[in-house]
Amino acid sequence: SAPGEDEECGAVRDFVAKLANNTHQHVFDDLRGSVSLSWVGDSTGVILVLTTFHVPLVIMTFGQSKLYRSEDYGKNFKDITDLINNTFIRTEFGMAIGPENSGKVVLTAEVSGGSRGGRIFRSSDFAKNFVQTDLPFHPLTQMMYSPQNSDYLLALSTENGLWVSKNFGGKWEEIHKAVCLAKWGSDNTIFFTTYANGSCKADLGALELWRTSDLGKSFKTIGVKIYSFGLGGRFLFASVMADKDTTRRIHVSTDQGDTWSMAQLPSVGQEQFYSILAANDDMVFMHVDEPGDTGFGTIFTSDDRGIVYSKSLDRHLYTTTGGETDFTNVTSLRGVYITSVLSEDNSIQTMITFDQGGRWTHLRKPENSECDATAKNKNECSLHIHASYSISQKLNVPMAPLSEPNAVGIVIAHGSVGDAISVMVPDVYISDDGGYSWTKMLEGPHYYTILDSGGIIVAIEHSSRPINVIKFSTDEGQCWQTYTFTRDPIYFTGLASEPGARSMNISIWGFTESFLTSQWVSYTIDFKDILERNCEEKDYTIWLAHSTDPEDYEDGCILGYKEQFLRLRKSSVCQNGRDYVVTKQPSICLCSLEDFLCDFGYYRPENDSKCVEQPELKGHDLEFCLYGREEHLTTNGYRKIPGDKCQGGVNPVREVKDLKKKCTSNFLSPEKQNSKSN
């Protein structure tokens, strides 16, 4: 049972009748295979559902797919398979939905062997109508929309050609051959890597990075000896092979590849990798894999240029095999990230940062929970969160942690309470303050989703048996009501609600199984009558984010400013509504040394906030010194943390040093140093 189900909870009046009047069943009259669901546009109510069914015949596989459309958030569906001429749609490409509210959809069809190219179905009116287009190539990837112009599409062909369309897939032009990876940048720029000799695999580390800013009319080679590249925020990253050995290093550009700087990060060998964990316009979190098959590495955080990096977290779990990491951006509170570390005894522990990677700590033990068997001390332990890694290990974890930007402070996750992640059946925990404090919300594993910007939380028990009950809470998970949405239980497969957590509709997907057949079925529940009135001023209360000590003058200051939010009172049962905008009021804090990171050539001694000059430069610091650009080697030792808005207070002004003088090494002759390239 859920905490709160047995307590004196303010039950929502007549909720069974209200929900019963707003529960809509739809049975799909085709055999159960796989189903994929996509929302088309924002606040349009349009959902596309593609069901596919494979029948293995003697020599080949016979496939059948059906396309359904809803325009009322899933309450009713219409079979629109005839709009795509009953063609079998390739599910591995999914449904390519256009950005923003463009209303564009591209479906990639299966075509018979020997055909000249593939086939797509295009819609630009929210899937009311489709146009069939035969392609002059066989697509290898899903069509990619330009973020700036949804008429511009790019795709890679099975023969490694880069194809571009300027009229939403009507006409296609091959703009380059021998392409390994292509990505849209800003301003309709395309970045791509090409191989000269054999293939993408054979030329790994010898690829060239190209850029076109005019959809293929002209090109510029912006990098050579490329292993791979990535885009994050305003940064373009490339891992580049070293001249002398098989190692590679990260180079960074903030001007679309015109100029590059070497990043002050360790180089990696053939078996290692770099990974951009998160990036915005201010900074980047970079994972650097440890040598050997350790399953962990180090997180580094960048300065505002993406060049100087501070070590943020050691022994960061990131498996080489499955490429799984638990790194999670808590989108409901600025500066908060959660991830896992692999401790010396090989147990996995959860860590959280509230200041964008400056400091990491364990999660506080929930007040209403006991320490489990993994805890040495039964009174002292932490909450450990199950995320991607646990899911990949097939633990009983149906969902990753959940947070939404418009449900301020709310984080929901599966977890266990002890000294490390436990393989026991997890419970569901909630934080209403962005991860500072936690409460057990539901007993056992559940699927969960946030509706109406946090006004309602919905959950369904994860069970191997058929289910017919949904739970919901109107007070951020403290009290729970249960509603039986059907007399006949279904095998549950998923919860679907419109992305953005503004909707009040939830769709429960599953299938019914009888002696001979099994069919897809969905139940869509509209909670609008539970939240029967619009929220007013009196329904909100003021909350200071990141508050830990009210007696501290700078309480709540993170990255140089504090933010107060209007939060819905837990007792208010009302609609935030689709147009709800988070009301927040920032106030600038005074600067302290904590608002600055140590620039290149400087470090912070343990338990000291001052940046001290490194006596000698070693390892990758020395390499950066030797091969970095000269203007990055002149510093006063401090740089403002990216995104930090503090003013006044401490201003660490001191003598500017030219670190070029320290760029000396026993391995290099003076001539080599003088001729170093910038």
Epitope: C479, K538, T541, I542, G556, Q564, R569, S572, Q585
Partner: antibody
Amino acid sequence: QVQLVQSGAEVKKPGSSVKVSCKASGGTFRNYAISWVRQAPGQGLEWMGGIIPIGGWANYAQKFQGRVTITADESTSTAYMELSSLRSEDTAVYYCARQGRKTGYYYYYGMDVWGQGTTVTVSS
Amino acid sequence: DIQMTQSPSTLSASVGDRVTITCRASQSISSWLAWYQQKPGKAPKLLIYKASSLESGVPSRFSGSGSGTEFTLTISSLQPDDFATYYCQQADGHITFGGGTKVEIK
């Protein structure tokens, strides 16, 4: 130790306004909400409204909306409550109180420090 | 606004008695309830916050319980200094107080 010191007693005519001050000392004034509570002779406690000094966010009880204005001056660590259109029923002791705070919520933890009270008498 | 109903309004008890005062909210307020003690001519004093947390410096004979809509304040063994008026206050809506319970000598 935090202290709240209120201004002295007032005698006012009906229809006029009164402004009561509440000065904080010995604590971090800006990080706590200040509430104003009144108590008519022989009656119970009645919350009028509150303010958070950072940002000056004020909120008022429905009953006093439009008639009460609560402000705060961070530089002097002083909160003010002004009540207009006074009537005889407004005769009461007016208290300012600091809202205790354990988390980011300003109003959820009770009022842990109180002023000594200011008697306001409304009489023609 | 949320209404708070306190009972009884007056309670006669002797030193050493166990005293219980109840407070009912017109809708669920979770645990956001405080209890105060007030003596004539003095400002109220916070005893309990968040329904059951004892304010520092308050004797342990005072305890609070409840959540949702029903709450109680208990004085396990009444002392001479405890004869006063007690108020509950909810904090999950615009703040409202209960009508008060006067604990007097029997």
